[in-house]
Amino acid sequence: TASKAWTLEVLYAPRRLRVSMSPGDQVMEGKSATLTCESDANPPVSHYTWFDWNNQSLPYHSQKLRLEPVKVQHSGAYWCQGTNSVGKGRSPLSTLTVYYSPETIGRR
């Protein structure tokens, strides 16, 4: 008798979320910094929310948060939340550190 092959698709809320930073987590002022919310989810994340370490939501809702030019005032810890049709998940905190260039320090 012929047997049928079945595929079981498991849906789950976003998990293993993390914030990655490019070019790194320590960036000189005036350069650009990109924070990316990475996750494992099925179905894929449909909505992203970004938060600072005071748990204030930020006005960014895409997977990537681009800061250009980056300022010392952007220094801090960030986390992201991903949402799909199953539920939500959140990342741990990741810290972005912005430091003054030698030229800026020399002018002060």
Epitope: V72, S75, G76, I105
Partner: nanobody
């Protein structure tokens, strides 16, 4: 220009405790303060940071062993390090609102 003066550090045996402190010459402390470290041949990495509201974030390696604190009035940020391990050996740098200090050596012997 903000001057950061670091103190503390030194040589300690594994399992021991040590504290490092940093004082800023001007009244900043409005964005983020913290401690970073750089071991020989490695990149500088974040150890612990704190903001003016008192929110903190620790590296996984520091969680549960190190405690960061700040005194806004005295313009100081301190790091209490307990249960030190040889892999904690590094130059520890203070960070305050965009400025890094010159660093202070912490050596943990086995």
């Amino acid at each position: 220009q903000v001057q950061l003066v670091e103190s503390g550090g030194g040589l300690v045996q594994a399992g021991g405790s040590l504290s490092v402190s940093c004082t800023a010459s001007e009244s900043t402390f409005s964005i983020m303060m913290g401690w970073f470290r750089q071991a020989p041949g490695k990149q500088r990495e974040m150890v612990a940071v704190i903001n003016s509201a008192g929110s903190t974030n620790y590296a996984d390696s520091a969680e549960g062993r190190f405690t960061i604190s700040r005194d806004l009035a005295k313009k100081t940020v301190s790091l209490q390090m307990n249960s030190l391990k040889p892999e904690d050996t590094a130059v520890y740098y203070c960070y305050v609102d965009g400025y890094f200090g010159q660093g202070t050596q912490v050596t943990v012997s086995s």
